[in-house]
Interface confidence: low
C-alpha cells in the first residue's frame, strides 16, 4: 500500500442492538467501506472501565482467533464484510462491542466503528410460541415452586431407588477403589456438557503450536463421591474478562507470526 494516508472511509458495525438467548450464536457484521491492500481488522469488547479488550482479529489471509475460541471472525465473499460471531453466547457476554480497522503499515490509520450492544438473555424453558394463556390457576412463581419441589422429590426418590438397587445387586462392591478414566479415553459428554467448538480455518495453512496441557489430576482413593472440575482456560490477565472456554489446547500462531512455528 503505497499511500495509506488517505482519509479512512467509515466502518459500520451492525446491528446496533442484538439480543440472543444464552447458548445461541451472536453475530455482528463489521463492514469496510473500501478494501485497503494491507489491513488488520480487530474485534473489541468495551470493558466496564471503557478499555477496549481485543477478542479476535483478521488480517490479510489469516485469522487470529484470539484467546477465547468462541470469538470468530469470518470474511464474507464480497471482501468488505466480516461476520464477528460469539459461539454459544453466555449471559456475561452481554456488553458493548465494536470493530476497529488499521491500515498497514503506518502512517497507521486506526479507525473504530460505532458501538453495538449485545444482550444475552436467559434461556426460557417453555417454547417461545405459546398457546393462548390458560385460565389462571397458580401464579407463575408458585407454579414454578411446586414444579421445582416436585422435581427435587422425584429426583431424591429415584436416587434412593437406584442406591438400593445397586446395593442389592453389588453387595460386595469394593470400597475405596479408585476408578480413573484412562488418559486416552475421551470424557463422556452428557446433554449438559459444554460443547467444544472447532474453528473453521478453511484452507489456511497453519502450523499448530501446542500449549503444555495440565497433567491429569491424581486419583484420590477412599472417597465415595467424585467430581471432575475442568478449568480449560489459562488465567485471564488483570482487567480482562476470564472465559471458561478459552482453550489451553493447540493454538494457531497469531497472524503476524509468519509461517514459522512459534516458539522454537
Amino acid at each position: 500500500l503505497d499511500s495509506p494516508d488517505r482519509p479512512w472511509s467509515p466502518l459500520t458495525f451492525s446491528p446496533a442492538q442484538l439480543t440472543v438467548q444464552e447458548g445461541e450464536n451472536a453475530t455482528f457484521t463489521c463492514s469496510l467501506a473500501d478494501i485497503p491492500d494491507s489491513f488488520v481488522l480487530n474485534w473489541y469488547r468495551l470493558s466496564p472501565r471503557n478499555q477496549t479488550d481485543k477478542l479476535a482479529a483478521f488480517q490479510e489471509d489469516r485469522i487470529e482467533p484470539g484467546r477465547d475460541r468462541r470469538f470468530r471472525v469470518t470474511r464474507l465473499p464480497n471482501g468488505r464484510d466480516f461476520h464477528m460471531s460469539i459461539v454459544a453466547a453466555r449471559l456475561n457476554d452481554s456488553g458493548i462491542y465494536l470493530c476497529g480497522a488499521i491500515y498497514l503499515p503506518p502512517n497507521t490509520q486506526i479507525n473504530e466503528s460505532p458501538r453495538a450492544e449485545l444482550s444475552v438473555t436467559e434461556r426460557t424453558l417453555e417454547p417461545p410460541t405459546q398457546s393462548p394463556s390458560p385460565p389462571p390457576r397458580l401464579s407463575g412463581q408458585l407454579q414454578g415452586l411446586v414444579i421445582g419441589v416436585t422435581s427435587v422429590l422425584v429426583g431424591v426418590l429415584l436416587l434412593l431407588l437406584l442406591t438400593w438397587v445397586l446395593a442389592a445387586v453389588f453387595p460386595r462392591a469394593t470400597r475405596g477403589a479408585c476408578v480413573c478414566g484412562s488418559e486416552d479415553e475421551p470424557l463422556k459428554e452428557g446433554p449438559d456438557a459444554a460443547p467444544v467448538f472447532t474453528l473453521d480455518y478453511g484452507e489456511l495453512d497453519f502450523q499448530w503450536r501446542e500449549k503444555t496441557p495440565e497433567p491429569p489430576a491424581p486419583c484420590a482413593p477412599e472417597q465415595t463421591e467424585y467430581a471432575t472440575i475442568v478449568f480449560p482456560g489459562r488465567p485471564a490477565s488483570p482487567g480482562r474478562r476470564a472465559s471458561a472456554s478459552s482453550l489451553q489446547g493447540a493454538q494457531p500462531p497469531s497472524p503476524e507470526d509468519g509461517p514459522g512455528l512459534w516458539p522454537l
Epitope: D53, K54, D61
Partner: antibody, heavy 118, light 113 residues
Framework: EVQLVQSGAEVKKPGASVKVSCKAS?????SFWMNWVRLAPGAGLEW???????????HYNQKFKDRAILTVDTSTSTAYMELSSLRAGDIAVYYC???????????WGQGTLVTVSA | EIVMTQSPGSLAGSAGESVSINCKSS????????????LAWYQQKPGESPKLLIY???TRESGVPDRFSGSGSGTDFTLTINNLQAEDVGVYYC?????????FGQGTKLEIK
C-alpha cells in the same frame, strides 16, 4: 501520533543486570507485539525477542533466552527488557519496536545505550 | 535460524545515480499459502533509529520516496535506490520475519561520493 520513548543510557558492571523501559503512546498498547532489537558497535541489528502486551506471551531469540526477560505494564503502556549477567559483548544500543500486524518493525524507540564497564 | 547475507558491505554512489543492495537468505522466505515474501528493508541514518522502508519484499512503506524499490523472491532480494540523494547516506538492513528468530543482514553502508 505513535511514539515509543525509551529510558536513558545505562552504565553497568560486568555480571550486573539492566532494565530498559519503553513507554508507548498513540495506539492501543495491548493490540500489538513489542519487539526488542539491539545494535552493537561493529555489528548489525540483532533481534532479542518480543512480548505480546495482551497476555505477556513472549518469544525469544534462543541466544538471549536465558538472560533476557521481556515484560509489560499495561496500566502504563510500558514494555521492559531486562538483560542479566552483562558482559562486554552486551554493549549496544537497545531498541524497542512495535510490529503492527505482520512482523516488520514499523515504529522504533529512540534507543538506549547500555555500557558495560568494570 | 535463517541467515541473511547482504552485499556489498559498503558502497559509494554519486548523487543522481542508482545503487543496488543485495540480500540473500539461507532458506526461502516465500510462503506458499499467500505467495508473500517475508522480507523487510530498513534504513538507519547516522545517530537515528532504524526506519522501515519496504515490507513484503516490494511494498513501500508510507512516506518512503518512490526512489526506493524492493524486488526479488524466495532467497534473493534487492533494494534499489534511484536518483541517489545526499540524505540517503546510512546503513541499510534486510530482515526476514519468516521464522523465529527474526534475523537481519549485517548491513550495507551507503556513502555519497
Amino acid at each position: 501520533e505513535v511514539q515509543l520513548v525509551q529510558s536513558g543510557a545505562e552504565v553497568k558492571k560486568p555480571g550486573a543486570s539492566v532494565k530498559v523501559s519503553c513507554k508507548a503512546s498513540g495506539y492501543t498498547f495491548t493490540s500489538f507485539w513489542m519487539n526488542w532489537v539491539r545494535l552493537a558497535p561493529g555489528a548489525g541489528l540483532e533481534w532479542i525477542g518480543r512480548v505480546d502486551p495482551y497476555d505477556s506471551e513472549t518469544h525469544y531469540n534462543q541466544k538471549f533466552k536465558d538472560r533476557a526477560i521481556l515484560t509489560v505494564d499495561t496500566s502504563t503502556s510500558t514494555a521492559y527488557m531486562e538483560l542479566s549477567s552483562l558482559r562486554a559483548g552486551d554493549i549496544a544500543v537497545y531498541y524497542c519496536a512495535t510490529q503492527f500486524g505482520f512482523s516488520w518493525l514499523a515504529y522504533w524507540g529512540q534507543g538506549t545505550l547500555v555500557t558495560v564497564s568494570a | 535460524e535463517i541467515v541473511m547475507t547482504q552485499s556489498p558491505g559498503s558502497l559509494a554512489g554519486s548523487a543522481g545515480e542508482s545503487v543496488s543492495i543485495n540480500c540473500k537468505s539461507s532458506q526461502s522466505l516465500l510462503y506458499s499459502s499467500n505467495q508473500k515474501n517475508y522480507l523487510a528493508w530498513y534504513q538507519q541514518k547516522p545517530g537515528e533509529s532504524p526506519k522501515l522502508l519496504i515490507y513484503w519484499a516490494s511494498t513501500r512503506e508510507s512516506g518512503v520516496p518512490d526512489r526506493f524499490s524492493g524486488s526479488g523472491s524466495g532467497t534473493d532480494f534487492t533494494l534499489t535506490i534511484n536518483n541517489l540523494q545526499a540524505e540517503d547516506v546510512g546503513v541499510y538492513y534486510c530482515q526476514q520475519y519468516y521464522s523465529n528468530p527474526y534475523t537481519f543482514g549485517q548491513g550495507t553502508k551507503l556513502e555519497i561520493k
